[in-house]
Interface confidence: low
């Protein structure tokens, strides 16, 4: 046998090249045949009325057409054939890759709630072979369930991916990102998720710097409230009590002017959304005005635990008076 | 050459903050997800967070949030660290990030953190 | 919290095989990577997508992922793959992160 051929693979549209090689020529006849097995090249004469077929080549040793424009119908086995003595027959597989005509990325919603779980589809449509789908949210891959269907010769997928969202998830894109022989470098579709959640209360004291509140001094605080969507209620109470007379609110800021040790106690910031509700509490405690001219030294201590809650602890250096805790966050 | 380069660790006492900088060669920072990861001495590696390239969003381990901040520049991606203390004593590496696989490191700065 | 564990330290024979595990409650469900890192330098991609070696990296190298279990097989051991491994995975279902490294493996090459 000194007739050669190679398979070749081709993405549906281009130029699928077909080649017979001759070893040892002897000036015997070549010809090459479709999957019909219709002569498309006698020699140098095209016989098939089909002009997307060119001659590339035409020797004693090899005849070498090109086909443009491949569709998928084009695929199959074409004949070299070599009239010698016994003839020789060798054929070539032509393999057609299709890619995906259409990628689409559906979100169950346009807008989820944290803790929600939301599914999101995506659909590879009509590609050979089969697509594959890869799932991920911002740079973390995710595992996806994919559904094949088949028509034709032709592939459609769709990958369902569950997702459990939350807060940090917010503005955060979900990929999907397609592999596919047809396809070179990134063929991808996302989506950014936009997550609602409840506010984060955090209660800032603005007045007195120093952190220790005397009597006679004056009092401001400052609720900060963050949420999606922006918390549209923030309201001050004072726990288990009436808020004090002489007390101003003014929108997020508390102000007490003249404390006096029946202003002690709790007082709570409140903030709400649609999503949901959140307080954070404030201890007031009113210490005696100053004896001496010098001011005590305060040491502040931060401590953030996983649940948020947010302790701030106030230490007076002078003999008798002992730390309270002033803010705890919920 | 792709490649990464940290800078700005030094040392400092505790709570100084501290502002690293991560400057690309070979590569256009903008096309890519980029991480943070740091390891003390004698430790493994910890990572830190994520700018990814599409929205500018950021993503935090846990222990960070709220202390460490990255941001990211056409040329360049820092990482702002407050509230230091001695546990942070560690070399920072910045990382490409494509798609959960860092696969261009610098060589990492060192911070080191003492009284 | 979501932990990958893998042993501390491992020795292996000059030229023999060994394998390096991470195991975590659900890394079935994840993708695993590995990176090698020599002392005083930055960490190198060895694997990803649990199987997958970017070019450049010796097919001496290969990963596996089943079960709770990913593995690196280092086959024909040699003296220049003294060094920490370190497996990661990212975990996309849960809110405080999506990227998390194991402890380390330091593996000696003796002979």
């Known amino acids: 046998q000194n007739l050669f051929t190679k398979d070749v693979t081709v993405i549906e549209g281009e130029v699928a090249t077909i080649s017979c090689q001759v070893n040892k020529s002897d000036d015997s006849v070549i010809q090459l045949l479709n999957p019909n097995r219709q002569t498309i090249y006698f020699r140098d004469f095209r016989p098939l009325k089909d002009s997307r077929f060119q001659l590339l080549n035409f020797s004693s040793s090899e005849l070498k057409v090109s086909l443009t424009n491949v569709s998928i119908s084009d695929e199959g086995r074409y004949f070299c054939q070599l009239y010698t003595d016994p003839p020789q027959e060798s054929y070539t597989t032509i393999t057609v890759l299709v890619p995906p005509r259409n990628l689409m990325i559906d979100i169950q919603k346009d807008t989820a709630v944290e803790g929600e779980e939301i599914e999101v589809n995506c659909t590879a449509m009509a590609s050979k072979p089969a697509t594959t789908i890869r799932w991920f949210k911002g740079n973390t891959e995710l595992k996806g369930k994919s559904e094949v269907e088949e028509w034709s010769d032709m592939y459609t997928v769709t990958s369902q991916l569950m997702l459990k969202v939350h807060k940090e998830d917010d503005g955060v894109p979900v990929i999907c990102q397609v592999e596919h022989p047809a396809v070179t470098g990134n063929l991808q579709t996302q989506r950014y998720l936009e997550v609602q959640y409840k506010p984060q209360v955090h209660i800032q004291m603005t007045y007195p710097l120093q952190g220790l509140t005397r009597e006679g001094d004056a009092l401001e605080l400052t609720c900060e409230a963050i949420g999606k969507p922006q918390p549209v209620m923030v309201t001050w109470v004072r726990v288990d009590d009436e808020m004090p007379q002489h007390a101003v609110l003014s929108g997020p800021n508390l102000f007490i002017n003249n404390l006096n040790k029946t202003d002690n106690g709790t007082y709570r910031c409140e903030a709400s959304n649609i999503v949901g509700k959140a307080h954070s509490d404030y201890m007031l405690y009113v210490y005696d005005p100053p004896t001496t001219i010098p001011p005590p030294t305060t040491t502040t201590t931060t401590t953030t635990t996983t649940t948020t809650t947010i302790l701030t602890i106030i230490t007076d250096s002078r003999a008798g008076e002992e730390g309270s805790i002033r803010a705890v966050d919920h | 050459q792709e490649q990464l380069v940290e800078s700005g660790g030094r040392l400092v006492t505790p709570g100084t903050p501290l502002t690293l900088t991560c400057k690309a060669s070979g590569f256009s920072l903008g096309k890519y997800d980029m991480s943070w990861v740091r390891q003390a001495p004698g430790k493994g590696l910890e990572w830190i967070g994520t700018?990814?390239?599409?929205?500018?969003s950021t993503w935090y381990a846990s222990w960070a949030k709220g202390r460490f901040t990255i941001s990211k520049t056409s040329t360049t991606v820092d990482l702002k660290m407050t509230s230091l203390t001695t546990e942070d004593t560690a070399t920072y590496f910045c990382a490409r990030d494509f798609l959960g696989v860092n696969s261009i490191w610098g060589p990492g700065t060192l911070v080191t953190i003492s009284s | 919290s979501f932990v990958l564990t893998q042993p501390a330290s491992v020795q292996v024979n000059l030229g023999q095989t060994v394998s390096l595990t991470c195991t975590a409650d659900?890394?079935?469900?994840?993708?695993a990577s590995w990176y090698q890192q020599k002392p005083d330098q930055a960490p190198v991609l060895l694997i990803h997508r649990d199987t997958s070696r970017p070019s450049g990296v010796p097919d001496r190298f290969s990963g596996s992922n089943s079960g709770n279990t990913a593995t690196l097989t280092i086959s024909g051991a040699q003296a220049g793959d003294e060094a920490d491994y370190y497996c990661a995975t990212s975990d996309g279902s849960g809110s405080n992160f999506h990227f998390v490294f194991g402890g380390g493996t330091q593996l000696t090459v003796t002979g």
């Open positions: 700018i990814y390239a599409g929205s500018g």
């Open positions: 659900t890394l079935s469900r994840s993708y």
